[in-house]
């Protein structure tokens, strides 16, 4: 269930906001990747 987020707090697919502050932690996207020449390559 890949969801890509704008910095605004919107999710691209359905524009659902993180409305309640208590949900901030559970809606942070984890970034797992390898830095190669200044570019992050997803692993």
């Amino acid at each position: 269930d890949a969801e890509f987020r704008h910095d605004s707090g919107y999710e691209v697919h359905h524009q659902k906001l993180v409305f309640f502050a208590e949900d901030v932690g559970s809606n942070k996207g984890a970034i797992i990747g390898l830095m190669v020449g200044g570019v992050v390559i997803a692993c």
């Epitope: 269930d1 659902k16 502050a21 208590e22 809606n27």
Partner: antibody
Framework: EVQLVESGGGLVQPGGSLRLSCAAS????????MSWVRQAPGKGLELVAQ????????YYPDTVKGRFTISRDNAKNTLYLQMNSLRAEDTAVYYC?????WGQGTLVTVSS | DVVMTQSPLSLPVTLGQPASISCRSS???????????LHWFLQKPGQSPRLLIY???NRFSGVPDRFSGSGSGTDFTLKISRVEAEDVGVYYC?????????FGQGTKVEIK
């Protein structure tokens, strides 16, 4: 498209019970806190229950504490409100809300 | 609970003229992430509330740019640059920084 659809409202006698349901779609339901908000005729918005994303924490105002129970089934993308020992003053339109999105509301009328 | 106080409670407006609603919270709405979770809703007669402005100053999807929000800490303002006929209804400020979610009393905007 985000949608919240309530059901289960109706006419009930004082002291009776009702169970409201809210079917959610268009977003990852399990990641978001949800609430039930009511509005008595001609009045403002009143939160009656709030539940966190995983269902481990709930909040009720004193007006409904001990009588109402909020729960959720994240596998079914559904929010519930069990209402017991209903009183005339519980008469209102009940909305399911994720904050940014609200359902159409379901009318609960408590009367003999 | 965080108490939200709106003023005025009734606002007669002239079409094409600006309008402003104030909202004050009983405690700071700044969350640990640096954001204030202060929002504005509009409820038109017979409809569910709909989100206009989220996190103080961000217009929600589809909201006209004549609506703007500002403020910080405990004092916030909603402004309509030029009121249109479709803007009539009850405006609510709301905070979701702290549990429980709380609402202002509502400001009824009507055309003079």
């Amino acid at each position: 498209e985000v949608q919240l659809v309530e059901s289960g409202g109706g006419l009930v006698q004082p002291g009776g019970s009702l169970r409201l349901s809210c079917a959610a779609s268009g977003f990852t339901f399990s990641r978001y806190s949800m609430s039930w908000v009511r509005q008595a005729p001609g009045k403002g918005l009143e939160l009656v229950a709030q539940i966190n994303s995983v269902g481990t924490s709930t909040y009720y105002p004193d007006t409904v504490k001990g009588r109402f129970t909020i729960s959720r089934d994240n596998a079914k993308n559904t929010l519930y409100l069990q209402m017991n020992s209903l009183r005339a003053e519980d008469t209102a339109v009940y909305y399911c809300a994720s904050g940014d999105y609200w359902g159409q509301g379901t009318l609960v009328t408590v009367s003999s | 609970d965080v108490v939200m106080t709106q003023s005025p409670l009734s606002l007669p407006v002239t079409l094409g003229q600006p309008a402003s609603i104030s909202c004050r919270s009983s405690q700071s709405l700044i969350y640990s992430d640096g954001n204030a979770y202060l929002h504005w809703f509009l409820q038109k007669p017979g409809q569910s509330p709909r989100l206009l402005i989220y996190k103080v100053s961000n217009r929600f999807s589809g909201v006209p740019d004549r609506f703007s929000g500002s403020g910080s800490g405990t004092d916030f303002t909603l402004k309509i640059s030029r009121v249109e006929a479709e803007d009539v209804g009850v405006y609510y400020c709301s905070q979701s920084t702290h549990v429980p979610w709380t609402f202002g009393q509502g400001t009824k905007v009507e055309i003079k």
